[in-house]
C-alpha cells in the first residue's frame, strides 16, 4: 500500500495491516529453579518470571508452566541467554593426569512443542565444551533466530544442567519472543 | 484490520498504524576510547561512532555523550557485541603456581537510565570468566533482547575493563536498538 | 497515523504502510560443506539449506550460490550462529613446551557484496581465540545486528576454517535476515 491514492469505495478491501503495538510479545527472566520431575531423555526445562521487573507478556502471548504459548501464526523472532557458572570441571582435573578426555559441556536448547506432533522440535541450540582451569568459571550462551510458528505452538528453554544456571539476576538469564 | 471491508465513514477511526520506515533505529560502531573520567562504582561506558561507515541513527533516535536517546515509548529490540582482547590473564599466571584463584572476567552491561529514577537499570548482562593460557586471547560477548522503553529513556553500554575492548574494526564491537 | 480520524476523500494519500507478512525473510540452516574453490585472501563462504526442515525463504528473499539476495532496500536484521568443533589446538600443544604462542582462532564474518562496489563489506565479525586443553572442544559464535541494505545486495557467511564447522544439526549453525 505504498503511497497510493484511494477513491472511497463501499467495498474497499484492506491488506492484513495491523498495529505493531498489538503484536504478541514476551520477555521472561530467570527465577531460581526448584527441583522438579523432568522428562526422561530430555534436558530439563527452565521456568521463568513473566511479570515482575523487566519481564512481561502482552497481546495474548501467555506464559504457563515453563511454556510460552503462541497465540497466532506468523514469523517470530525468538531469543534466549543462559548464564552458566560452576567450579573447575572434571575435564581439567582429568587433563592434569595427562590423559585425553571427553570435555564437560553446557548446552541451551530452545524447543518447540506442537500438540499435534509427537516429538518436540529443537529450534536453536548453543553448546560449548567447558575445560576451565580457574576454580570458578562462568559464561553465557546466547541464541536468537526467526521461525515460522503456528497458533498453539509452545516454546520452552532446556538446559543440560539446571544446577549450573545463574539465577541471581534478571539481566543474565532470559527468554523472549515477538511476532515480526 | 485483517481483510475487513469498510464502508466510508465521516468518523472512521484508524488503529495506530505507522510506516515501518519511520521507526526510531540506530546501529553504533566502536571507536577508540580515550582515557576519561568515569562514574565511581559503575563500569565505564563506551562511546560510539554514530554516522560514519556502518553506523547510523534515524527517525529521531539520537546519540549523544555515550547515550542512545529513546524518542518514543514502545517495545525495542536492543543489542550489542563487545569484542575483548588481552594478554595472558593473571588468573593463569597464579594458576601456574598451583593455587586455586578467583578468575579474571569480562563483562558487558546494557544499561537504561531514566531521569525520573535515581538508579540505572541493568537490562542485559554478559559476563565471562577468562582463564586463558595462550599469550594473546580475544573473544566477543553478544547480547540482545526486547524491552519496553519510555520516551526520554537513555541507553548505554558499560564494560568491566575499557582498555580490553577491541576498537580496531566496526564489525567487532557495536551497539544498536530499533522500535518493534 | 496514530488514532486519527479521517473524513473520506477522493485524494486520501496513505503513508507507505505494508503488511508485515509480505516482508522479505529467510532462515537458512547448515548443510555439510563440500570442498570448493574459495576466493584468495577471503575466508571461505558457507552454503546453506533454504527449504527443508526449519529453513525457508519468503517474499522474494532468495538464496542462491551461498548468497542471500536482498530484494528491496530497507533496514534488515541479520543474524548467524556457527558452531565450531575441533581437537586440541596447536596452541595448547606449543604451550606445553613452555613457549608463548599465537593462539589458534575461530572467526565468523557476515559479509555484504554490492555489485557496483569492488570490495565486499564486513558487516559483523565474531572472532575468538581457541586455546582449549581437552581433547575435543566445541563452541558457538553468534552474531546479529541491523543494517541498511540496498536492493540487489548479497549476504554471505564466511568462516576462518570450514572444516571445523559443525554441520550435524540445523539448530546449531544457521543464518537469517528479515526486513524490519
Amino acid at each position: 500500500l505504498k503511497g497510493q491514492e484511494f477513491a472511497p469505495s463501499h467495498q474497499q478491501v484492506y491488506a492484513p495491516l495491523r498495529a505493531d503495538g498489538d503484536k504478541p510479545r514476551a520477555h521472561l527472566t530467570v527465577v531460581r529453579q526448584t527441583p522438579t520431575q523432568h522428562f526422561k531423555n530430555q534436558f530439563p526445562a527452565l521456568h521463568w518470571e513473566h511479570e515482575l521487573g523487566l519481564a512481561f507478556t502482552k497481546n495474548r502471548m501467555n506464559y504457563t508452566n515453563k511454556f510460552l504459548l503462541i497465540p497466532e501464526s506468523g514469523d517470530y523472532f525468538i531469543y534466549s541467554q543462559v548464564t552458566f557458572r560452576g567450579m573447575t570441571s572434571e575435564c581439567s582435573e582429568i587433563r592434569q593426569a595427562g590423559r585425553p578426555n571427553k570435555p564437560d559441556s553446557i548446552t541451551v536448547v530452545i524447543t518447540k512443542v506442537t500438540d499435534s506432533y509427537p516429538e518436540p522440535t529443537q529450534l536453536l541450540m548453543g553448546t560449548k565444551s567447558v575445560c576451565e582451569v580457574g576454580s570458578n568459571w562462568f559464561q553465557p550462551i546466547y541464541l536468537g533466530a526467526m521461525f515460522s510458528l503456528q497458533e498453539g505452538d509452545k516454546l520452552m528453554v532446556n538446559v543440560s544442567d539446571i544446577s549450573l544456571v545463574d539465577y541471581t539476576k534478571e539481566d543474565k538469564t532470559f527468554f523472549g519472543a515477538f511476532l515480526l | 484490520l485483517k481483510g475487513q471491508e469498510f464502508a466510508p465513514s465521516h468518523q472512521q477511526v484508524y488503529a495506530p498504524l505507522r510506516a515501518d520506515g519511520d521507526k526510531p533505529r540506530a546501529h553504533l560502531t566502536v571507536v577508540r576510547q580515550t582515557p576519561t573520567q568515569h562514574f565511581k562504582n559503575q563500569f565505564p561506558a563506551l562511546h560510539w561512532e554514530h554516522e560514519l561507515g556502518l553506523a547510523f541513527t534515524k527517525n529521531r533516535m539520537n546519540y549523544t555523550n555515550k547515550f542512545l536517546l529513546i524518542p518514543e515509548s514502545g517495545d525495542y529490540f536492543i543489542y550489542s557485541q563487545v569484542t575483548f582482547r588481552g594478554m595472558t590473564s593473571e588468573c593463569s599466571e597464579i594458576r601456574q603456581a598451583g593455587r586455586p584463584n578467583k578468575p579474571d572476567s569480562i563483562t558487558v552491561v546494557i544499561t537504561k537510565v531514566t531521569d525520573s529514577y535515581p538508579e540505572p537499570t541493568q537490562l542485559l548482562m554478559g559476563t565471562k570468566s577468562v582463564c586463558e593460557v595462550g599469550s594473546n586471547w580475544f573473544q566477543p560477548i553478544y547480547l540482545g533482547a526486547m524491552f519496553s522503553l519510555q520516551e526520554g529513556d537513555k541507553l548505554m553500554v558499560n564494560v568491566s575493563d575499557i582498555s580490553l575492548v577491541d576498537y580496531t574494526k566496526e564489525d567487532k564491537t557495536f551497539f544498536g536498538a530499533f522500535l518493534l | 497515523l496514530k488514532g486519527q480520524e479521517f473524513a473520506p476523500s477522493h485524494q486520501q494519500v496513505y503513508a507507505p504502510l505494508r503488511a508485515d507478512g509480505d516482508k522479505p525473510r529467510a532462515h537458512l540452516t547448515v548443510v555439510r560443506q563440500t570442498p570448493t574453490q574459495h576466493f584468495k585472501n577471503q575466508f571461505p563462504a558457507l552454503h546453506w539449506e533454504h527449504e527443508l526442515g526449519l529453513a525457508f525463504t519468503k517474499n522474494r528473499m532468495n538464496y542462491t550460490n551461498k548468497f542471500l539476495l536482498i530484494p528491496e532496500s530497507g533496514d534488515y536484521f541479520i543474524y548467524s550462529q556457527v558452531t565450531f568443533r575441533g581437537m586440541t589446538s596447536e596452541c595448547s600443544e606449543i604451550r606445553q613446551a613452555g613457549r608463548p604462542n599465537k593462539p589458534d582462532s575461530i572467526t565468523v564474518v557476515i559479509t555484504k557484496v554490492t555489485d557496483s562496489y569492488p570490495e565486499p563489506t564486513q558487516l559483523l565479525m565474531g572472532t575468538k581465540s581457541v586455546c582449549e586443553v581437552g581433547s575435543n572442544w566445541f563452541q558457538p559464535i553468534y552474531l546479529g545486528a541491523m543494517f541498511s541494505l540496498q536492493e540487489g545486495d548479497k549476504l554471505m557467511v564466511n568462516v576462518s576454517d570450514i572444516s571445523l564447522v559443525d554441520y550435524t544439526k540445523e539448530d546449531k549453525t544457521f543464518f537469517g535476515a528479515f526486513l524490519l
Epitope: - | 576510547q33 582515557p35 568515569h38 565505564p44 593473571e90 580490553l164 577491541d166 | -
Partner: antibody
C-alpha cells in the same frame, strides 16, 4: 584535561637503582593501563612494561624481567617504575604513557632523563 | 618478539609533498598497528590506531593503511609542522615493539 606529570631528572651510578614517578590526572586512573617506554639518546622507542592500576597486575618485556618493577598508589593516582642494577646502557629518557586500550599509548608524560655515569 | 622495520630511515621533502612511509612486521599483526609522531625533545604524539583509523584531533592529511604484515603511513600534503620522526608500533602481542623510526626533514 588528561595529564601525566613525571618526576625530575636523575643521575645515578652504575649498579644503583632509580625510581621514577608518574602522577595522573583528568581521568579515572584505575580504568586504563599505564605503560613505561624508554628512549636512549638519538635512538628509538623501547617498551618496558605495563601495570593494570585496577588489579596491580604487571607485564614486562623479557629484556627487563627481574630488573624492573612497576607499582602504583591508587590513592594518589600515581605509578612508579623502578629499575635496578643500572648500567650506562640505561641512560635514557623514561616516559610513562596511558592508553585508551592496553596496546597503545594515547597520552605521554613529559619524560624523565636518567643518566647513569661513574 | 615481533620485529618492526621501517623504510626509508629518513627522507627529505618539501611543503606540499605527498609522503609515504612503510612499516613491516616480522609476523602477521592483523590491524593492531599504531603510528606516532615525535619532534626533538618532546614526547611522541599518537596519530593513527588500528592501522587506518585517525586518532581524534589529528589532521585528515594523515592516513594509514594495511593489515597483516605490511602497513603504510601517508601524509597527503606535507605541512611545516609535520617535519618530525615517525614510529610504527605493533599492539598485537607482548612485548610491544616499535619500528626504528623514519625522520622526515626539509629538502
Amino acid at each position: 584535561e588528561v595529564q601525566l606529570v613525571q618526576s625530575g631528572a636523575e643521575v645515578k651510578s652504575p649498579g644503583a637503582s632509580v625510581k621514577v614517578s608518574c602522577k595522573a590526572s583528568g581521568y579515572t586512573f584505575t580504568a586504563y593501563y599505564m605503560h613505561w617506554v624508554r628512549q636512549a639518546p638519538g635512538q628509538g622507542l623501547e617498551w618496558m612494561g605495563w601495570i593494570n592500576p585496577n588489579s596491580g597486575g604487571t607485564k614486562y618485556a623479557q629484556k627487563f624481567q627481574g630488573r624492573v618493577t612497576v607499582t602504583r598508589d591508587t590513592s594518589i593516582s600515581t605509578a612508579y617504575m623502578e629499575l635496578n642494577r643500572l648500567t650506562s646502557d640505561d641512560t635514557a629518557v623514561y616516559y610513562c604513557a596511558v592508553g585508551g586500550s592496553y596496546d597503545a599509548f594515547d597520552i605521554w608524560g613529559q619524560g624523565t632523563m636518567v643518566t647513569v655515569s661513574s | 618478539d615481533i620485529v618492526m622495520t621501517q623504510s626509508p630511515s629518513s627522507l627529505s621533502a618539501s611543503v606540499g609533498d605527498r609522503v609515504t612511509i612503510t612499516c613491516r612486521a616480522s609476523q602477521s599483526i592483523s590491524s593492531y598497528l599504531n603510528w606516532y609522531q615525535q619532534k626533538p625533545g618532546k614526547a611522541p604524539n599518537f596519530l593513527i590506531y588500528g592501522a587506518s583509523r585517525l586518532q581524534s584531533g589529528v589532521p585528515s592529511r594523515f592516513s594509514g593503511s594495511g593489515s597483516g604484515t605490511d602497513f603504510t603511513l601517508t601524509i597527503s600534503s606535507l605541512q611545516p609542522e609535520d617535519f618530525a620522526t615517525y614510529y610504527c608500533q605493533q599492539g598485537y602481542s607482548s612485548p610491544f615493539t616499535f619500528g626504528p623510526g623514519t625522520k622526515v626533514d626539509i629538502k
